[in-house]
């Protein structure tokens, strides 16, 4: 009778993390008389995956009743296959022998490959926001992925960027990679609405890629543009100074008015307007009492927005056309473009 | 084509640490053994151990307790430390790839370094 | 640890004559699966070793068909069917069935 052959029909298998992975194996003769044993790798270093004879394998089943006495069919099936698992695994008879079994015949091997999913791509923007004009940085990162080949893309509201490095680690073997890439991105005035996106594509994924994303409303600053002027006057003695401020972004603003440098009043804008691009647009204004004034005015707007140095414009409010009215201590009336009344 | 590196100081002092690294180019650490191999002046090869990919390590029993060997897969290099050393570890030191596909034993080891000069001297 | 004992010790050559070297194992290198785990190098002068034979007699790829092995269980024999200028160097043989892996002293071939 010819000699006992180990045959492993499938010289490597691909499954996909998560999944189960059948190794097949199958003996030519029931002689001679001996157990299966499976081993991940070759030589002394091998690990024992399965053994017919003896030992808990909660992770694997065999394919066919190895207790039937005809049975030659010595596959596996290794359950929840993580990168981890990845190798050459060996069908290994021995043959019965006192007090040990002995190592009779291999199998040639199969290489065991595992593909797993990157995880969703996450993308970060600067800590701290940026004005128009200047080069900000994303990073774009995910992990988890195998084998290593993957293709990583920027968008900036759907046009490709080319700006951008990417790494994938380790750069030597691993049972699974992760990928980090970091885009350069110019601001824009109308970026408020933009958004910058990081394609992940992957075997893996069968065509259909991850997609993270970030708003550059999260990473923009706007500074606001003022104009004051002079609104005719409301009363005899009366004059009505508006402080427009436009195209800021992000809402958070304080302004404050000035008479001739001291501080008159301070608000902060809530009812604002919102413009086509995202920017606002706000209006305060001063209700000035000139006969309280022997000289000439200089009202300033200043304005504090998201935390910056104030910016400030100024407007110099004639009073000598005007007549005084001796006694009175009102310099300006507080109204602002949410507080109408005059009190 | 694999490709193997030796790197390290050529010169370690008596009592001091002999610490080398061998670099992996051109291939799959996995499914191999990453071996240590030392031939004093004018002498024969001596085995000093190896590292299987799964990080099981084999050491020869008359160097093991001063042997240390790693595998970083990540950056494609194996490294050898040995402690306390002495004017007898004077030896070219080889870095070698021994392959394994059937059974317990080794299938020849295919791939090594050119060798690198390490001189313990005071 | 298994003793691997070489001869000769040194072997002067004809250029185009054979060769034959000899490597015996302190124990036997024949595993219960039929393999002999024995293999053959040639260390070239100035060179690192370079693997010539594995499994007492499985050719290394890229070895010319002038070298063969032979043997089993605890004698083998390195073959060189007609002897070249490029062979000159050490051979070794070494154990592959156990660790520790050990070496044969080496046969130094020289042209006469």
């Known amino acids: 009778e010819e000699e006992l052959q180990v045959i492993q029909p499938d010289k490597s298998v691909l499954v996909a993390a998560g999944e189960t992975a059948t190794l097949r194996c199958t003996a030519t003769s029931l002689i001679p008389v001996g157990p299966i044993q499976w081993f991940r790798g070759a030589g002394p270093g091998r690990e024992l995956i399965y053994n017919q004879k003896e030992g808990h394998f909660p992770r694997v089943t065999t394919v066919s009743d190895l207790t039937k006495r005809n049975n030659m069919d010595f596959s596996i099936r290794i359950g929840n296959i993580t990168p981890a698992d990845a190798g050459t695994y060996y069908c290994v008879k021995f043959r019965k022998g006192s007090p040990d079994d002995v190592e009779f015949k291999s199998g040639a091997g199969t290489e065991l490959s595992v593909r797993a999913k990157p995880s969703a791509p996450v993308v970060s923007g600067p800590a701290a926001r940026a004005t128009p004009q200047h080069t900000v940085s994303f990073t774009c990162e995910s992990h988890g992925f195998s084998p290593r080949d993957i293709t990583l893309k920027w968008f900036k509201n759907g046009n490709e960027l080319s700006d951008f490095q990417t790494n994938v680690d380790p750069v030597g073997e691993s049972v699974s990679y992760s990928i980090h890439s970091t885009a350069k991105v110019v601001l824009t005035r109308e970026d408020v609405h933009s958004q910058v996106i990081c394609e992940v594509a992957h075997v893996t994924l069968q065509g259909d890629p991850l997609r993270g994303t970030a708003n550059l409303s999260e990473t923009i600053r706007v500074p606001p543009t003022l104009e004051v002027t002079q609104q005719p006057v409301r009363a005899e003695n009366q004059v009505n100074v508006t402080c427009q401020v436009r195209k800021f972004y992000p809402q958070r603003l304080q302004l404050t008015w000035l008479e001739n440098g001291n501080v008159s009043r301070t608000e902060t804008a809530s009812t604002v307007t919102e413009n086509k691009d995202g920017t606002y647009n706000w209006m305060s204004w001063l209700l000035v009492n000139v006969s309280a004034h022997r000289d000439d005015v200089k009202l300033t707007c200043q304005v504090e927005h998201d935390g910056q140095p104030a910016v400030s414009k100024s407007h110099d409010l004639k009073v000598s056309a005007h007549p005084k009215e001796q006694g009175s201590n009102t310099a300006a009336e507080n109204t602002g473009s949410n507080e109408r009344n005059i009190y | 084509q694999v490709q193997l590196q030796e790197s390290g100081p050529g010169l370690v002092r008596p009592s001091e640490t002999l610490s080398l690294t061998c670099t992996v180019s051109g291939g799959s650490i996995r499914n191999y053994y990453w071996s240590w191999i030392r031939q004093p002046p004018g002498k024969g090869l001596e085995w000093i151990g190896f590292i299987y990919y799964n990080g099981r390590t084999f050491y020869n029993p008359s160097l093991k307790s001063r042997v240390t060997i790693s595998l970083d897969m990540s950056i494609n290099q194996f490294s050898l430390k040995m402690t306390s050393v002495t004017a007898a570890d004077t030896a070219v030191y080889y870095c070698?790839?021994?392959?394994?596909?059937?059974?317990?034993?080794?299938?020849?080891?295919?791939?090594w370094g050119q060798g690198t000069t390490v001189t313990v001297s005071s | 640890d298994i003793v691997m004992t070489q001869s000769p010790l040194s072997l002067p050559v004809t250029p185009g004559e054979p060769a034959s070297i000899s490597c015996k194992s302190s124990?036997?290198?024949?595993?219960?699966?039929?393999?002999?785990?024995l293999d053959w190098y040639l260390q070239r002068p100035g060179q690192s070793p370079q693997l010539l034979i594995y499994q007492g007699s499985n050719r290394a790829s890229g070895v010319p068909d002038r070298f063969s092995g032979s043997g089993s269980g605890t004698d083998f024999t390195l073959k060189i069917s007609r002897v070249e200028a490029e062979d000159v160097g050490v051979f070794y043989c070494?154990?592959?069935?156990?660790?520790?892996?050990?070496f044969g002293g080496g046969t130094k071939v020289e042209i006469k």
């Open positions: 070698a790839r021994v392959r394994a596909y059937s059974g317990i034993g080794l299938d020849g080891t295919d791939v």
């Open positions: 124990q036997s290198l024949l595993y219960s699966n039929g393999y002999a785990y």
């Open positions: 070494m154990q592959a069935l156990q660790t520790p892996l050990t």
